[in-house]
Protein backbone atom coordinates (compact mmCIF):
# COMPACT_ATOMS: atom_id res chain seq x y z
CA UNK A 1 0.00 0.00 0.00
CA UNK A 2 1.50 3.33 -1.08
CA UNK A 3 0.55 6.98 -1.30
CA UNK A 4 0.25 8.06 -4.92
CA UNK A 5 -0.58 11.73 -4.28
CA UNK A 6 0.61 13.13 -0.96
CA UNK A 7 -1.91 14.80 1.35
CA UNK A 8 -2.69 18.45 0.69
CA UNK A 9 -4.62 20.36 3.31
CA UNK A 10 -6.65 23.55 3.56
CA UNK A 11 -7.97 25.24 6.67
CA UNK A 12 -11.19 27.17 7.17
CA UNK A 13 -9.24 29.23 9.76
CA UNK A 14 -11.79 28.36 12.36
CA UNK A 15 -12.26 24.77 13.40
CA UNK A 16 -11.70 22.40 10.49
CA UNK A 17 -8.82 21.57 8.18
CA UNK A 18 -9.45 19.23 5.28
CA UNK A 19 -6.74 16.97 3.90
CA UNK A 20 -7.03 14.99 0.67
CA UNK A 21 -4.74 12.39 -0.87
CA UNK A 22 -4.72 9.49 -3.30
CA UNK A 23 -3.57 5.92 -2.76
CA UNK A 24 -2.02 3.72 -5.44
CA UNK A 25 -5.12 1.56 -5.65
CA UNK A 26 -8.68 1.14 -4.36
CA UNK A 27 -8.64 1.64 -0.59
CA UNK A 28 -11.19 1.49 2.18
CA UNK A 29 -9.92 4.70 3.76
CA UNK A 30 -11.89 4.50 7.01
CA UNK A 31 -10.82 0.97 7.91
CA UNK A 32 -7.29 0.86 6.50
CA UNK A 33 -5.89 4.33 7.20
CA UNK A 34 -5.48 6.83 10.03
CA UNK A 35 -4.18 10.39 9.83
CA UNK A 36 -2.54 11.53 13.07
CA UNK A 37 -2.12 15.26 13.60
CA UNK A 38 -0.45 17.14 16.41
CA UNK A 39 -0.01 20.84 17.06
CA UNK A 40 3.67 21.68 17.46
CA UNK A 41 3.24 23.11 20.92
CA UNK A 42 4.41 22.34 24.42
CA UNK A 43 2.61 19.32 25.93
CA UNK A 44 0.27 18.83 23.00
CA UNK A 45 -1.10 15.38 22.17
CA UNK A 46 -1.54 13.53 18.88
CA UNK A 47 -5.12 13.35 17.62
CA UNK A 48 -6.57 10.85 15.16
CA UNK A 49 -8.61 11.60 12.06
CA UNK A 50 -10.53 8.74 10.44
CA UNK A 51 -10.55 9.35 6.68
CA UNK A 52 -13.47 8.86 4.32
CA UNK A 53 -13.37 7.66 0.74
CA UNK A 54 -13.29 10.30 -1.96
CA UNK A 55 -13.45 8.26 -5.14
CA UNK A 56 -11.93 4.81 -5.53
CA UNK A 57 -8.35 5.56 -4.50
CA UNK A 58 -8.96 8.97 -2.96
CA UNK A 59 -9.26 9.74 0.76
CA UNK A 60 -10.37 12.85 2.64
CA UNK A 61 -9.99 13.66 6.32
CA UNK A 62 -11.58 16.48 8.30
CA UNK A 63 -9.21 17.50 11.09
CA UNK A 64 -11.02 19.05 14.03
CA UNK A 65 -9.19 21.98 15.62
CA UNK A 66 -10.08 24.15 18.59
CA UNK A 67 -9.21 27.33 16.72
CA UNK A 68 -6.42 28.60 14.50
CA UNK A 69 -3.78 31.29 14.96
CA UNK A 70 -1.07 32.29 12.52
CA UNK A 71 1.77 30.68 14.50
CA UNK A 72 0.19 27.21 14.44
CA UNK A 73 2.03 24.35 12.78
CA UNK A 74 0.95 20.71 12.73
CA UNK A 75 2.80 17.47 12.17
CA UNK A 76 0.89 14.94 10.07
CA UNK A 77 1.48 11.17 10.04
CA UNK A 78 -0.45 8.87 7.72
CA UNK A 79 -0.60 5.30 9.02
CA UNK A 80 -1.80 2.00 7.58
CA UNK A 81 -1.90 -0.14 10.70
CA UNK A 82 1.68 -0.11 12.05
CA UNK A 83 3.15 1.17 8.79
CA UNK A 84 3.97 4.84 8.43
CA UNK A 85 3.09 5.73 4.84
CA UNK A 86 3.81 9.45 4.88
CA UNK A 87 5.02 12.14 7.25
CA UNK A 88 4.56 15.85 6.70
CA UNK A 89 3.59 19.16 8.23
CA UNK A 90 0.87 21.73 7.70
CA UNK A 91 0.64 25.39 8.62
CA UNK A 92 -3.09 26.31 8.50
CA UNK A 93 -2.51 30.05 8.07
CA UNK A 94 -0.62 29.41 4.84
CA UNK A 95 -3.36 27.27 3.29
CA UNK A 96 -6.67 28.99 4.01
CA UNK A 97 -9.89 28.35 2.16
CA UNK A 98 -12.60 30.48 3.80
CA UNK A 99 -16.00 29.12 4.68
CA UNK A 100 -18.73 29.90 2.17
CA UNK A 101 -21.03 32.83 2.96
CA UNK A 102 -24.61 31.91 3.84
CA UNK A 103 -28.14 33.23 3.95
CA UNK A 104 -27.99 34.96 0.57
CA UNK A 105 -31.16 36.99 0.18
CA UNK A 106 -32.35 39.20 -2.66
CA UNK A 107 -34.52 42.13 -1.56
CA UNK A 108 -36.60 43.33 -4.51
CA UNK A 109 -38.81 45.84 -2.73
CA UNK A 110 -36.31 48.72 -2.60
CA UNK A 111 -37.67 50.97 -5.41
CA UNK A 112 -35.86 49.86 -8.56
CA UNK A 113 -32.77 48.67 -6.73
CA UNK A 114 -31.85 45.09 -6.02
CA UNK A 115 -30.31 44.63 -2.60
CA UNK A 116 -28.41 41.39 -2.10
CA UNK A 117 -27.36 40.55 1.45
CA UNK A 118 -25.58 37.54 2.91
CA UNK A 119 -24.00 36.47 6.16
CA UNK A 120 -20.32 36.57 7.01
CA UNK A 121 -19.42 32.94 7.73
CA UNK A 122 -17.16 33.83 10.68
CA UNK A 123 -17.93 34.99 14.22
CA UNK A 124 -16.73 38.50 15.12
CA UNK A 125 -13.86 37.18 17.25
CA UNK A 126 -12.31 35.35 14.29
CA UNK A 127 -9.51 37.18 12.48
CA UNK A 128 -11.09 36.63 9.07
CA UNK A 129 -14.36 38.28 10.09
CA UNK A 130 -13.05 41.75 9.21
CA UNK A 131 -10.88 40.65 6.29
CA UNK A 132 -13.25 39.01 3.83
CA UNK A 133 -14.12 40.40 0.45
CA UNK A 134 -16.66 38.81 -1.84
CA UNK A 135 -17.59 37.99 -5.41
CA UNK A 136 -21.26 37.87 -6.34
CA UNK A 137 -22.25 35.87 -9.39
CA UNK A 138 -25.58 36.65 -11.06
CA UNK A 139 -26.86 34.74 -14.06
CA UNK A 140 -30.01 34.26 -16.07
CA UNK A 141 -31.61 30.86 -16.07
CA UNK A 142 -32.86 31.51 -19.61
CA UNK A 143 -29.72 32.92 -21.20
CA UNK A 144 -26.35 31.28 -20.38
CA UNK A 145 -24.56 34.29 -21.87
CA UNK A 146 -26.17 36.58 -19.31
CA UNK A 147 -23.59 35.86 -16.62
CA UNK A 148 -21.89 38.49 -14.51
CA UNK A 149 -19.54 38.83 -11.52
CA UNK A 150 -19.60 41.75 -9.09
CA UNK A 151 -16.55 42.19 -6.87
CA UNK A 152 -17.44 43.44 -3.39
CA UNK A 153 -14.20 44.89 -2.02
CA UNK A 154 -15.72 46.57 1.04
CA UNK A 155 -16.44 44.71 4.26
CA UNK A 156 -20.22 44.98 4.35
CA UNK A 157 -21.83 41.74 3.14
CA UNK A 158 -24.21 43.37 0.72
CA UNK A 159 -24.48 44.53 -2.87
CA UNK A 160 -26.83 47.07 -4.45
CA UNK A 161 -27.44 47.07 -8.16
CA UNK A 162 -30.02 48.79 -10.32
CA UNK A 163 -32.71 46.33 -11.35
CA UNK A 164 -32.49 47.85 -14.81
CA UNK A 165 -28.98 46.46 -15.31
CA UNK A 166 -30.70 43.08 -15.62
CA UNK A 167 -33.41 42.11 -18.07
CA UNK A 168 -36.95 42.54 -16.87
CA UNK A 169 -39.48 39.75 -16.72
CA UNK A 170 -37.08 36.86 -16.40
CA UNK A 171 -35.68 34.80 -13.54
CA UNK A 172 -32.16 35.24 -12.22
CA UNK A 173 -30.01 33.35 -9.76
CA UNK A 174 -27.26 34.66 -7.52
CA UNK A 175 -24.52 33.13 -5.42
CA UNK A 176 -21.63 34.55 -3.45
CA UNK A 177 -18.16 33.44 -2.41
CA UNK A 178 -15.43 34.91 -0.23
CA UNK A 179 -11.68 35.30 0.04
CA UNK A 180 -9.22 37.13 2.29
CA UNK A 181 -6.29 39.01 0.82
CA UNK A 182 -4.43 39.14 4.12
CA UNK A 183 -3.75 35.40 4.04
CA UNK A 184 -3.72 35.12 0.25
CA UNK A 185 -6.47 32.55 0.58
CA UNK A 186 -8.14 30.58 -2.16
CA UNK A 187 -11.77 31.38 -2.91
CA UNK A 188 -14.38 29.75 -0.75
CA UNK A 189 -16.97 27.47 -2.28
CA UNK A 190 -19.98 29.27 -3.67
CA UNK A 191 -22.92 29.76 -1.35
CA UNK A 192 -26.17 28.03 -2.24
CA UNK A 193 -27.83 30.06 -4.96
CA UNK A 194 -31.03 32.00 -4.56
CA UNK A 195 -33.59 32.75 -7.28
CA UNK A 196 -35.82 35.74 -7.97
CA UNK A 197 -37.98 37.11 -10.76
CA UNK A 198 -36.61 40.40 -12.00
CA UNK A 199 -39.25 42.98 -12.86
CA UNK A 200 -39.10 46.74 -12.76
CA UNK A 201 -40.98 49.68 -14.20
CA UNK A 202 -39.56 50.84 -17.51
CA UNK A 203 -38.89 54.59 -17.41
CA UNK A 204 -41.63 56.60 -19.19
CA UNK A 205 -40.33 57.70 -22.57
CA UNK A 206 -41.39 61.15 -23.87
CA UNK A 207 -41.58 61.72 -27.65
Amino acid sequence: MKVLQEPTCVSDYMSISTCEWKMNGPTNCSTELRLLYQLVFLLSEAHTCIPENNGGAGCVCHLLMDDVVSADNYTLDLWAGQQLLWKGSFKPSEHVKPRAPGNLTVHTNVSDTLLLTWSNPYPPDNYLYNHLTYAVNIWSENDPADFRIYNVTYLEPSLRIAASTLKSGISYRARVRAWAQCYNTTWSEWSPSTKWHNSYREPFEQH
Epitope: Y37, L42, L43, E45, H47, L64, V69, A71
Partner: antibody, heavy 125, light 112 residues
Protein backbone atom coordinates in the same frame (compact mmCIF):
# COMPACT_ATOMS: atom_id res chain seq x y z
CA UNK B 1 -11.38 19.95 46.33
CA UNK B 2 -8.53 19.75 43.82
CA UNK B 3 -5.49 18.38 45.61
CA UNK B 4 -1.98 17.04 44.97
CA UNK B 5 -0.08 15.07 47.62
CA UNK B 6 3.60 14.19 47.16
CA UNK B 7 5.48 11.40 48.89
CA UNK B 8 8.70 9.43 48.55
CA UNK B 9 11.27 12.00 49.60
CA UNK B 10 14.05 11.23 52.03
CA UNK B 11 17.77 11.01 52.61
CA UNK B 12 19.82 9.22 49.94
CA UNK B 13 23.50 8.83 49.22
CA UNK B 14 25.09 10.21 46.04
CA UNK B 15 24.60 7.74 43.21
CA UNK B 16 21.46 6.36 44.86
CA UNK B 17 17.85 6.35 43.72
CA UNK B 18 14.47 7.63 44.93
CA UNK B 19 11.00 7.49 43.48
CA UNK B 20 8.67 10.38 44.18
CA UNK B 21 4.91 10.03 43.86
CA UNK B 22 2.20 12.66 43.46
CA UNK B 23 -1.42 11.62 43.97
CA UNK B 24 -4.07 13.81 42.34
CA UNK B 25 -7.70 14.15 43.32
CA UNK B 26 -10.67 16.39 42.61
CA UNK B 27 -10.02 16.72 38.86
CA UNK B 28 -9.88 14.50 35.77
CA UNK B 29 -6.24 13.58 36.20
CA UNK B 30 -5.72 12.02 32.74
CA UNK B 31 -6.84 15.20 30.96
CA UNK B 32 -4.08 17.37 32.40
CA UNK B 33 -0.36 17.59 31.87
CA UNK B 34 1.67 17.48 35.09
CA UNK B 35 4.92 19.15 36.07
CA UNK B 36 7.68 18.72 38.67
CA UNK B 37 9.39 21.82 40.07
CA UNK B 38 12.12 21.84 42.73
CA UNK B 39 13.61 24.35 45.11
CA UNK B 40 17.08 23.94 46.57
CA UNK B 41 17.56 25.27 50.14
CA UNK B 42 17.52 29.08 50.12
CA UNK B 43 17.23 29.19 46.32
CA UNK B 44 14.57 29.98 43.75
CA UNK B 45 12.24 27.69 41.80
CA UNK B 46 13.63 25.38 39.12
CA UNK B 47 11.54 23.42 36.62
CA UNK B 48 12.45 19.72 36.46
CA UNK B 49 10.12 17.87 34.09
CA UNK B 50 6.66 17.82 32.48
CA UNK B 51 4.44 15.13 31.00
CA UNK B 52 1.30 15.39 28.88
CA UNK B 53 -2.00 13.85 29.94
CA UNK B 54 -1.53 10.61 28.01
CA UNK B 55 2.16 10.42 28.82
CA UNK B 56 3.00 10.66 25.14
CA UNK B 57 4.91 13.93 25.39
CA UNK B 58 7.70 14.39 27.95
CA UNK B 59 10.25 17.12 28.67
CA UNK B 60 13.24 17.32 31.04
CA UNK B 61 15.57 20.00 32.30
CA UNK B 62 19.13 19.47 31.03
CA UNK B 63 20.32 19.12 34.62
CA UNK B 64 18.30 15.90 35.12
CA UNK B 65 18.13 14.47 31.59
CA UNK B 66 19.26 10.85 31.48
CA UNK B 67 19.00 10.48 35.25
CA UNK B 68 15.37 11.27 36.07
CA UNK B 69 12.28 9.70 34.49
CA UNK B 70 8.81 11.20 34.70
CA UNK B 71 5.80 8.90 34.28
CA UNK B 72 2.16 8.65 35.22
CA UNK B 73 -0.45 6.01 35.95
CA UNK B 74 -3.79 7.54 35.01
CA UNK B 75 -5.70 4.56 36.41
CA UNK B 76 -4.25 5.46 39.83
CA UNK B 77 -4.32 9.25 39.31
CA UNK B 78 -0.64 9.30 40.19
CA UNK B 79 2.43 11.06 38.82
CA UNK B 80 5.94 9.72 39.41
CA UNK B 81 9.51 10.95 39.29
CA UNK B 82 12.14 8.21 39.27
CA UNK B 83 15.42 9.77 40.35
CA UNK B 84 18.60 7.80 39.63
CA UNK B 85 22.32 8.66 39.95
CA UNK B 86 21.46 11.26 42.56
CA UNK B 87 23.87 14.13 43.17
CA UNK B 88 24.28 16.57 46.04
CA UNK B 89 22.90 19.33 43.82
CA UNK B 90 19.59 17.43 43.55
CA UNK B 91 18.95 18.25 47.22
CA UNK B 92 15.71 20.24 47.21
CA UNK B 93 12.02 20.33 48.01
CA UNK B 94 10.21 18.73 45.07
CA UNK B 95 6.74 19.99 44.13
CA UNK B 96 4.31 18.50 41.66
CA UNK B 97 1.92 20.88 39.92
CA UNK B 98 -1.14 20.58 37.72
CA UNK B 99 -0.30 21.90 34.27
CA UNK B 100 -2.31 22.57 31.12
CA UNK B 101 -5.35 20.71 29.82
CA UNK B 102 -3.69 18.60 27.15
CA UNK B 103 -6.51 16.50 25.68
CA UNK B 104 -7.65 19.37 23.46
CA UNK B 105 -5.95 19.87 20.08
CA UNK B 106 -4.54 23.12 21.42
CA UNK B 107 -3.51 22.59 25.06
CA UNK B 108 -5.37 25.06 27.26
CA UNK B 109 -3.15 26.73 29.79
CA UNK B 110 -4.36 28.14 33.08
CA UNK B 111 -1.00 28.36 34.80
CA UNK B 112 0.40 25.84 37.27
CA UNK B 113 -2.76 26.32 39.24
CA UNK B 114 -2.50 23.58 41.87
CA UNK B 115 0.68 22.61 43.75
CA UNK B 116 1.43 19.82 46.18
CA UNK B 117 2.82 20.48 49.64
CA UNK B 118 6.30 19.39 48.55
CA UNK B 119 8.52 16.47 49.52
CA UNK B 120 12.11 16.92 50.65
CA UNK B 121 14.97 15.08 48.96
CA UNK B 122 18.37 15.22 50.60
CA UNK B 123 21.38 13.76 48.84
CA UNK B 124 24.34 13.43 51.19
CA UNK B 125 26.95 10.90 52.21
CA UNK C 1 16.74 28.63 26.88
CA UNK C 2 14.61 31.68 27.61
CA UNK C 3 16.07 33.78 30.42
CA UNK C 4 13.66 35.54 32.76
CA UNK C 5 15.07 38.59 34.56
CA UNK C 6 13.18 40.13 37.47
CA UNK C 7 13.63 43.49 39.14
CA UNK C 8 13.87 44.59 41.83
CA UNK C 9 15.11 41.56 43.76
CA UNK C 10 14.06 43.18 47.03
CA UNK C 11 11.00 45.36 47.50
CA UNK C 12 10.22 46.96 50.86
CA UNK C 13 6.68 48.41 50.82
CA UNK C 14 4.50 50.30 53.27
CA UNK C 15 1.07 48.68 53.81
CA UNK C 16 -1.58 50.36 51.67
CA UNK C 17 0.98 51.54 49.13
CA UNK C 18 1.25 50.13 45.60
CA UNK C 19 4.02 47.81 44.48
CA UNK C 20 5.32 46.85 41.07
CA UNK C 21 7.61 44.03 39.94
CA UNK C 22 9.12 43.83 36.46
CA UNK C 23 9.99 40.72 34.48
CA UNK C 24 11.85 40.71 31.20
CA UNK C 25 12.26 37.67 28.95
CA UNK C 26 15.11 37.08 26.50
CA UNK C 27 12.60 36.05 23.78
CA UNK C 28 9.03 37.03 23.03
CA UNK C 29 6.45 35.05 24.97
CA UNK C 30 3.61 36.15 22.71
CA UNK C 31 2.20 33.16 20.83
CA UNK C 32 -0.95 34.74 19.46
CA UNK C 33 -3.01 37.87 20.00
CA UNK C 34 -3.54 38.30 23.74
CA UNK C 35 -1.74 35.07 24.66
CA UNK C 36 1.58 35.63 26.41
CA UNK C 37 2.82 32.53 28.16
CA UNK C 38 4.04 34.17 31.34
CA UNK C 39 2.77 33.52 34.86
CA UNK C 40 3.29 35.09 38.26
CA UNK C 41 3.57 33.05 41.47
CA UNK C 42 3.79 33.98 45.13
CA UNK C 43 5.58 31.77 47.61
CA UNK C 44 4.94 32.64 51.20
CA UNK C 45 7.38 31.51 53.88
CA UNK C 46 7.24 27.74 54.43
CA UNK C 47 4.51 27.26 51.82
CA UNK C 48 4.19 25.94 48.28
CA UNK C 49 4.06 28.50 45.45
CA UNK C 50 0.61 29.74 44.49
CA UNK C 51 -0.53 30.99 41.11
CA UNK C 52 -1.50 34.66 40.89
CA UNK C 53 -1.55 35.51 37.18
CA UNK C 54 -1.41 33.39 34.01
CA UNK C 55 -1.14 34.35 30.33
CA UNK C 56 0.35 37.65 31.39
CA UNK C 57 -2.83 39.29 32.62
CA UNK C 58 -5.42 36.70 33.69
CA UNK C 59 -6.04 36.54 37.42
CA UNK C 60 -6.20 33.02 38.82
CA UNK C 61 -9.29 31.88 40.69
CA UNK C 62 -9.52 33.27 44.21
CA UNK C 63 -6.77 35.86 43.73
CA UNK C 64 -7.71 39.30 45.11
CA UNK C 65 -8.28 41.97 42.48
CA UNK C 66 -5.53 44.13 43.94
CA UNK C 67 -3.17 41.90 41.93
CA UNK C 68 -2.91 42.60 38.20
CA UNK C 69 -0.58 41.60 35.40
CA UNK C 70 0.26 43.48 32.25
CA UNK C 71 2.72 43.53 29.37
CA UNK C 72 3.31 41.70 26.15
CA UNK C 73 6.18 40.20 24.20
CA UNK C 74 9.23 40.50 26.42
CA UNK C 75 8.23 42.99 29.13
CA UNK C 76 5.81 42.12 31.90
CA UNK C 77 4.72 43.72 35.15
CA UNK C 78 2.95 42.51 38.27
CA UNK C 79 1.20 45.26 40.18
CA UNK C 80 -0.30 45.22 43.66
CA UNK C 81 -2.58 48.23 44.01
CA UNK C 82 -2.49 48.32 47.82
CA UNK C 83 -0.07 46.01 49.60
CA UNK C 84 -1.35 44.12 52.62
CA UNK C 85 0.69 42.39 55.32
CA UNK C 86 -0.31 38.96 53.98
CA UNK C 87 1.31 39.73 50.61
CA UNK C 88 4.86 39.25 51.91
CA UNK C 89 6.91 36.52 50.30
CA UNK C 90 8.82 35.77 47.14
CA UNK C 91 7.28 36.61 43.78
CA UNK C 92 8.37 34.67 40.68
CA UNK C 93 7.61 35.14 37.02
CA UNK C 94 7.77 32.02 34.83
CA UNK C 95 7.54 31.37 31.11
CA UNK C 96 5.71 28.30 29.88
CA UNK C 97 5.86 28.86 26.13
CA UNK C 98 8.81 26.56 25.46
CA UNK C 99 10.76 23.85 27.21
CA UNK C 100 12.50 24.28 29.54
CA UNK C 101 10.10 26.34 31.64
CA UNK C 102 12.19 29.07 33.24
CA UNK C 103 11.63 31.18 36.33
CA UNK C 104 12.85 34.62 37.27
CA UNK C 105 15.25 34.87 40.23
CA UNK C 106 12.45 35.94 42.55
CA UNK C 107 11.55 39.24 44.21
CA UNK C 108 11.33 39.41 47.97
CA UNK C 109 8.45 41.67 49.01
CA UNK C 110 8.64 42.77 52.64
CA UNK C 111 6.75 45.24 54.79
CA UNK C 112 8.58 48.40 55.83
Amino acid sequence: EVQLVESGGGLEQPGGSLRLSCAGSGFTFRDFAMTWVRQAPGKGLEWVSSISGSGGNIYYADSVKGRFTISRDNSKNTLYLQMNSLRAEDTAVYYCAKDRLSVTVRPRYYGLDVWGQGTTVTVSS
Amino acid sequence: DIVMTQSPLSLPVTPGEPASISCRSSQSLLYSIGKNYVDWYLQKSGQSPQLLIYEGNKRASGVPDRFSGSGSGTDFTLKISRVEAEDVGFYYCMQSLTSPYTFGQGTKLEIK
